[in-house]
């Protein structure tokens, strides 16, 4: 019994290696490779319903090399675990589990979410956005001028997209009424809307002042009163008493 | 047939270095890998470590502070030293061989050798 | 360090009966498993590695199977020298361990 054996385990030796196969240090023909030459690693291949032994120059998914003085080996990952780096820590995770700290998990812990991009846990992501930029022009039906009512927009942007987690984000537009001093409009702008289309020639007193930006058109609520003459005067205070209305829209 | 003999001192004083050898015929050291067992009376057994082909060792950390395997080819010879011995060394150490993770595992086995720790 | 528990620790049984033995590790060993018989005052003897290969002059009636943590050894009909105490080793990462063996006495 133990002769047979050893006869059999004399042709493993290294030194008596003919017949094995590339990386083989010793083989036997039922098991295919027994050890590996250094630096390669061991692994059991299955073949049919048989495992052989074959030794490889890196591990397959699901498998990391261990090295121990004089002998390799592909060990495998945890269950959970497609890739890893050892058996400890996972750098990829099966299906259906999120990776967090080399961990494997069903569901990612407090203060973190899913990623089921990347299946990570990933920290929540809130929504960041810009300071407001300046009130539009004040404008009706897209013009500045023949008109005293109309809207002004401002407008801001998103910094950072929130993830599914994360808070929404604010409104990034708002409108609100808008009122300023009634004013023809100049020649580039007639003719535009309505009755004004068929006019050719400008009128006597139309104001050849260039639209105002919109940093007067914000202060347009409170124009000094040595900007305007008397008869305009009038007409503000009238303006004055109907306070200004703001709309958001939200993204 | 491979053939693994183990001997050294059946009785070692607490505190001193346990010392034992494995005589190995019928194979040669520089191939496969050698291995020092032990088994406490009535108990189970427990992995110490080996020496390989080339002479590179592994040891359990469980021992690794007090563990020494070393080996002498020109007489086919590896040893053991197990430092600071205590009663809870008190064994039976086999010495045994394995070719590769492809092939059985402890395929020759010594005879064993019982070490009691006393004073 | 990888543990292996095996069970049960001791068993009765007569000639002719089949006895299960088994072992579980405390994580996936993916075959990499041996199971030795040990008869008092003697080495133990390897009986079968890599979970169900038989070493060679080794009975048939002696069997392994299982995979990930989960292994069996199976006598199909236990003769009166398969009476001795039965250890199943892991192999698959260092320090290798052993289970806490299983003692097969006469019924």
């Known amino acids: 019994q133990n002769a047979s054996r050893g006869r059999r385990q004399r042709r493993m030796h290294p030194n008596v290696s003919q017949g094995c196969q590339g990386g083989c240090a010793t083989c036997s023909d039922y098991n295919g490779c027994l050890s590996c030459k250094p630096r390669l690693f061991f692994a059991l291949e299955r073949i049919g319903m048989k495992q052989i032994g074959v030794c490889l120059s890196s591990c397959p998914s699901g498998y990391y090399g261990t090295r121990y003085p004089d002998i390799n080996k592909c060990t495998k990952c945890k269950a959970d675990c497609d890739t890893c780096f050892n058996k400890n820590f996972c750098t990829k995770c099966k299906s259906g589990f999120y990776l967090h700290l080399g961990k494997c998990l069903d569901n990612c812990p407090e203060g973190l979410e899913a990623n089921n991009h990347t299946m990570e846990c990933v920290s929540i992501v809130h929504c960041e956005v810009s300071e407001w930029n300046p009130w539009s022009p004040c404008t009706k039906k897209g013009k500045t001028c023949g008109f005293k009512r109309g809207t002004e927009t401002r407008v801001r942007e998103i910094i950072q997209h929130p993830s599914a987690k994360g808070n929404l984000c604010p409104p990034t537009n708002e409108t609100r009424k808008c009122t300023v001093q009634r004013k023809k409009c100049q020649k580039g702008e007639r003719g535009k809307k309505g009755r004004e289309r068929k006019r050719k020639k400008p009128n006597k007193g139309e104001s050849k002042e260039a639209i105002p930006d919109s940093k007067s058109l914000e202060s347009s609520k409170e124009i000094p009163e040595q900007r305007e003459n008397k008869q305009q005067q009038k007409k503000r205070k009238v303006q004055d008493k109907q306070k200004s209305v703001s709309v958001s829209t939200v993204h | 047939e491979v053939q693994l003999v183990e001997s050294g001192p059946g009785l070692v004083k607490p505190s001193e270095t346990l010392s034992l050898t494995c005589t190995v015929s019928?194979?040669?050291?520089?191939?496969?890998?050698w291995n020092w067992i032990r088994q406490p009376p009535g108990k189970g057994l427990e992995y110490m470590g080996y020496i390989s082909y080339s002479g590179k060792t592994y040891q359990n950390p469980s021992l690794k502070s007090r563990i020494t395997i070393s080996r002498d080819t020109s007489k086919n010879q590896y040893s053991l030293k197990l430092s600071s011995v205590t009663a809870a060394d008190t064994a039976v150490y086999y010495c045994a061989t394995y070719y590769g993770y492809g092939g059985p595992w402890f395929a020759y086995w010594g005879q064993g050798t019982l070490v009691t720790v006393s004073s | 360090d990888i543990q292996m528990t095996q069970s049960p620790s001791s068993l009765s049984a007569s000639v002719g009966d089949r006895v299960t033995i088994t072992c579980k590790a405390s994580?996936?060993?993916?075959?990499?498993l041996s199971w030795f018989q040990q008869k008092p005052g003697k080495a133990p003897k390897t009986l079968i590695y890599l979970t169900n290969r038989l070493v060679d002059g080794v009975p048939s009636r002696f069997s392994g199977s299982g995979s990930g943590q989960d292994y069996t050894l199976t006598i199909s009909s236990l003769q009166p020298e398969d009476f001795a105490t039965y250890y199943c080793?892991?192999?698959?990462?260092?320090?290798?361990?052993f289970g806490q063996g299983t003692k097969v006495e006469i019924k």
């Open positions: 080793l892991h192999y698959d990462e260092f320090p290798l361990t």
């Open positions: 019928g194979d040669s050291i520089t191939s496969g890998y």
């Open positions: 994580q996936d060993i993916d075959s990499y």
